[in-house]
């Protein structure tokens, strides 16, 4: 009876369990009743990082110097190239596909620490009583306006992104 499932590092094809290709190799031809799976090593700038049945290897990532990228770790037949940014620049994501001088803190967040050559901007959420309505790499959260000190009253409550709105007190006649 033909198998319906195969062992680890095997795959089912034509009612038969074939060995997967090891990392660093691609599939040339499936196994048959009489032959083993045929695999070939990936080329110079290619890789496959899992046991696989891929017919094409993946291209190594290109660390584009025009985007401020450089090679942190050269790729092998089993691993992709790892890019990083030039000194003083910071990756925009874990995958490090582009570089920024520093990131900005979004509205509702203030700058806790300005970026340096080694660390990116550190943002913190604006606590109650403070707000930030801008995207900035240097501005802290600002305190809400104190309406009382201006002899006014709060007409609209503040949020982490907006200041309070002050207005005149209702005068009793």
């Amino acid at each position: 009876e033909p198998p319906t499932a195969c062992r680890e590092k095997q795959y089912l094809i034509n009612s038969q369990c074939c060995s997967l290709c090891q990392p660093g190799q691609k599939l040339v031809s499936d196994c048959t009743e009489f032959t083993e799976t045929e695999c070939l090593p990936c080329g110079e700038s290619e890789f496959l990082d899992t046991w696989n049945r891929e017919t094409h290897c993946h291209q190594h990532k290109y660390c584009d110097p025009n985007l401020g990228l450089r090679v942190q770790q050269k790729g092998t037949s089993e691993t992709d190239t790892i890019c990083t940014c030039e000194e003083g620049w910071h990756c925009t994501s874990e995958a490090c596909e582009s570089c920024v001088l520093h990131r900005s803190c979004s509205p509702g967040f203030g700058v806790k620490q300005i970026a340096t050559g080694v660390s990116d901007t550190i943002c913190e959420p604006c606590p109650v009583g403070f707000f930030s309505n801008v995207s900035s790499a240097f501005e802290k959260c600002h305190p809400w306006t104190s309406c009382e000190t201006k002899d006014l009253v709060v007409q609209q409550a503040g949020t982490n992104k907006t200041d309070v709105v002050c207005g005149p007190q209702d005068r009793l006649r």
């Epitope: 620049w89 570089c99 920024v100 001088l101 520093h102 900005s104 790499a137």
Partner: nanobody, 116 residues
Amino acid sequence: EVQLLESGGGLVQPGGSLRLSCAASGFTFRDYEMWWVRQAPGKGLERVSAINPQGTRTYYADSVMGRFTISRDNSKNTLYLQMNSLRAEDTAVYHCAKEPYSYDYWGQGTLVTVSS
């Protein structure tokens, strides 16, 4: 296409002054926070000064506080850095930068050399 063109650098004696300019094009200048960043020979990047879009709030690194003044003219799409009481350690290539501060917006910069 975003372009930032720095100018105004040169050779100046210690204690002297220079005014750097950054002419911006390809984006709505008045909407963006702007920075001056410098790189001394063989050293890393140092964030010198920043200014908010309206020009009402500024930031200065401790190393330039009280000597440098950042400003902007939104009608001329230009950022400025007035540098007074210059020191040898201010020698660097000065760059302006805009949000989102990506590498492909990075200009050539303008070289400031402070030497007697």
